[in-house]
Interface confidence: low
């Protein structure tokens, strides 16, 4: 039975050229996390594996930094970065937990950072 809950930074906005931190947190379960995948729509951004550590996809290695913790820092944001991001927790014995974050990258200098932890 899957008892865990994913908390995420929810819907966030940031300025073009800036950076943003994507955060997920898995709670309410004693399951062992074996790997966390970060994905943007259908593209793999990064993997954090319990044995192998971090792997950043080659196409993102110049703009994605691991951390803090299991989070992901996106740098040099462009409008094309707008969209859905997913943190996928692979756990044993529970299985897979997925959290969703929507990022909007704005041209304006008045982008509000609405980052907050939300329980979907």
């Amino acid at each position: 039975m899957m008892t865990g809950t994913i908390e995420t930074t929810g819907n966030i906005s940031a300025e073009k050229g800036g950076s943003i931190i994507l955060q997920c947190h898995l709670s309410s379960t004693t399951a062992q996390v074996t790997q966390v995948n970060w994905e943007q729509q259908d593209q793999l951004l990064a993997i954090c594996n319990a044995d192998l550590g971090w792997h950043i996809s080659p196409s993102f290695k110049d703009r994605v930094a691991p951390g803090p913790g299991l989070g992901l820092t996106l740098q040099s944001l462009t409008v094309n970065d707008t969209g859905e991001y997913f943190c996928i927790y692979h756990t044993y014995p529970d299985g897979t937990y997925t959290g969703r974050i929507f990022l909007e990258v704005l041209e304006s200098s008045v982008a509000e950072h609405g980052a907050r932890f939300q329980i979907p």
Epitope: H25, L26, V33, V36, C48, A50, G67, P68, G69, L70
Partner: nanobody, 118 residues
Framework: EVQLVESGGGLVQAGGSLRLSCAAS????????MGWFRQAPGKEREFVGA????????YYADSVKGRFTISADNAKNTVYLQMNSLKPEDTAVYYC???????????WGQGTQVTVSS
Amino acid sequence: EVQLVESGGGLVQAGGSLRLSCAASGSIFSISDMGWFRQAPGKEREFVGAINWLSESTYYADSVKGRFTISADNAKNTVYLQMNSLKPEDTAVYYCAAQGGVLSGWDWGQGTQVTVSS
């Protein structure tokens, strides 16, 4: 498990400064990151920033970047959150959090209240 005790909260006027401290004890050798989060009345918990315990690399939410600074004193197992140019919207309970090995969750402190009056 890591035990965390925050201190330094209080009431301050807008534009003022506060320094929060977080003392860690217990399984401190497992810590990879120390973070600060906050929760304003009626809102969800929000990531403020974090510091890598070993490299001392820091990360900040855009809402506090340039105003808040996180530092660590490894000898004292303590992490600090220096908050400058405080705004009324910074009013919240501030929580210290520690993250263990590469795939661990956060351990939480009890929180300390920060109130910024206009």
